[in-house]
Interface confidence: low
Amino acid sequence: DAHKSEVAHRFKDLGEENFKALVLIAFAQYLQQCPFEDHVKLVNEVTEFAKTCVADESAENCDKSLHTLFGDKLCTVATLRETYGEMADCCAKQEPERNECFLQHKDDNPNLPRLVRPEVDVMCTAFHDNEETFLKKYLYEIARRHPYFYAPELLFFAKRYKAAFTECCQAADKAACLLPKLDELRDEGKASSAKQRLKCASLQKFGERAFKAWAVARLSQRFPKAEFAEVSKLVTDLTKVHTECCHGDLLECADDRADLAKYICENQDSISSKLKECCEKPLLEKSHCIAEVENDEMPADLPSLAADFVESKDVCKNYAEAKDVFLGMFLYEYARRHPDYSVVLLLRLAKTYETTLEKCCAAADPHECYAKVFDEFKPLVEEPQNLIKQNCELFEQLGEYKFQNALLVRYTKKVPQVSTPTLVEVSRNLGKVGSKCCKHPEAKRMPCAEDYLSVVLNQLCVLHEKTPVSDRVTKCCTESLVNRRPCFSALEVDETYVPKEFNAETFTFHADICTLSEKERQIKKQTALVELVKHKPKATKEQLKAVMDDFAAFVEKCCKADDKETCFAEEGKKLVAASQAALGL
């Protein structure tokens, strides 16, 4: 339905509080370097303007699109050229090119200082002094560091953040109450950001069809009792929501997500028996709950898949009549029967089925040609099953830290050109698949592991895209969305790599390592491990293990010493010399 004023429409639908929060998120995701105060000023100006449009939709400029209004506002920032360089050129363009230009300049790895958590008392004082500013600052800091964070979900995180401070700042032991909650929010937030980044990459790099295929598979697993028409409707609506959020249209996205949650809850009888509890919650919690809801039970009376998709003599006729609908039905059918498969595996099977039909429906005897198509699925299913089995065994044998180290070595040898911080971050996250998924029974391992790995490898792809250094990474990232993980798994040691020059400074450590948290200390050691492999890519596991064990002992010894700095200086030189000898550097 057409509205005279889009900004008034969204303000009325969302309410002032959500409107302001979403505009702040949008602006912070576009202008990631701007100070908080500047953004707040811009948001207040937009909000006041929106209120005038609510009062009179015919007022001047109220008929302009949100892109035009927001883009005009962003382009008033005085320091645009010196802060953002060529991004300022976007302001010379007209909509929709201007918005596209802003989107292209979103930075997945902005040069921003690490967020340091103040003392609990300091945070509680700030919260009590000005709760509104405190929460806005949270939205701003997360949004600018995660420019693709799913905006309506960030509102949910902010609500939980507020609840944590409201509860814990009154507690007897504030820190014991608050810190675990903040850790949980941080970890969940990083995971949520990474999952959304994959959705946006899927839409932006591989198109709407790829996203819709992913959504059909996932929703069919989740709602196996829903009919195809119902799943198709949900997929269409969900695609619209994510296209809007990934495109920076956060007001429309949040509004449409709320509508989708409403529709799902009004029609839960024909969607899933697991939605009841979700649908009793308030809006933000409801939407989050629906997005995370467990898979419904599979219907008991599903007929054989082969009847419709292999044995039928009309397969080619049905395929030719409506290719995407027929493939969609195949994907729906297969996915609802296989909650034990990863979404990416289901998409590989659908792709194989499509390729077979393309070939066979042009053959002399199509039925004879595609009769054995399901046999082609077997190796595709077994590959991730075997990989997960092997890696879970390795994880159970080594534990998370050493499993991460094994992956660090593996991936550094595959793509040694990638920057050390990226290799450490990605390999650490890849390694978390063990504790996240290996505890699950077999039926849940593959969807947990392979779909999680897709999210992590997408982080590698978006970070690498910013400064491409490896043709192998580019190839695996761009050729096929669903085959990224098998592509990286298949990479062997890069024989073309010229080992990095040895630099003693890289392996020089100081007493400050002793005051670091266990996690930070691990990262230091893992950074050193990546550098070792870059210097000596042909080093064996045993050689690397020996050097790392020596390194751990060296850190432990010097952190116990009275004169730590001297110990690090003297023992460090010995360690470097011993390591060079051990690795033949």
Epitope: K225, E227, F228, A229, E230, P299, A300, D301, L302, P303, S304, A307, D308, E311, S312, K313, D314, V315, K317, N318, E321, F326, M329, Y332, E333, R336
Partner: antibody, heavy 120, light 108 residues
């Protein structure tokens, strides 16, 4: 409003043929499995045949296999049942019933039926 | 082929609870659907997928399904509930729908 209207029933001699139709409206016909269910006078319900959404896969009760053919025309929103080699025991009220998207049952909507009588 | 067994008749006093059963080998592993049919009318789906009520069906109708028995329960039976009731499942091994023989519910 969802409607299923059967037609084409009548009196036919044993060994004869008849084609009954079901005109559908008020829903996206091409998205749903469709079925024929019959009820002999004073007896219970008996499922006769089902057809998938595209029309490419058909299902039959053992009692009619080889004699009856179910088909559909999605462009016309119409379901058909071609009955050949009819027997007196095929005498029944024939209902058209809307199934699901993939699982054939349950049958959420029914027509009012068309009477088929096989008698000499 | 798969068979469903229903007792031919069940009686219930007005406003009391009636239970109509449908027996089948491991029927609990299949989705059971229930239909109500009044004289001279087409059947109406009253319960689908074991225990789900279509919109417009009174709350007094409920269903359950486990083991070898599916059950349709009419709590607080009304005079208008007097009808024939049929259970139905899909037999995936034969790729065919199967109906029970039907139960006539009498409301006294």
């Amino acid at each position: 409003e969802l409607q299923l209207v059967e037609s084409g029933g009548g009196l036919v001699q044993p060994g004869g043929s008849l084609r009954v139709s079901c005109a559908a409206s008020g829903f996206t016909f091409s998205h749903y499995y469709m079925n024929w269910v019959r009820q002999a006078p004073g007896k219970g319900l008996e499922w006769v045949s089902g057809i998938n959404t595209g029309g490419g896969t058909t299902y039959y009760a053992d009692s009619v296999k080889g004699r009856f053919t179910i088909s559909r025309d999605n462009a016309k929103n119409t379901l058909y049942l071609q009955m050949n080699s009819l027997k007196p025991e095929d005498t029944a009220l024939y209902y058209c019933a809307k199934g699901g998207i993939v699982a054939v049952g349950g049958f959420g909507s029914w027509g009012q039926g068309t009477q088929v009588t096989v008698s000499s | 082929s798969y068979e469903l067994t229903q007792s031919p008749s069940v009686s219930v006093a007005l406003r009391q609870t009636a239970k109509i059963t449908c027996g089948g080998d491991n029927i609990g592993s299949k989705n059971a659907h229930w239909y109500q049919q009044k004289p001279g009318q087409a059947p109406v789906l009253v319960i689908y997928k074991d225990s789900n009520r279509p919109s417009g069906i009174p709350e007094r109708f409920s269903g359950s399904n486990s083991g070898n028995t599916a059950t349709l329960t009419v709590s607080g039976a009304q005079a208008e509930d007097e009808a024939d009731y049929y259970c139905q499942v899909w037999d995936s091994s034969a790729n065919a729908a199967v109906f029970g023989g039907g139960t006539h519910l009498t409301v006294l």
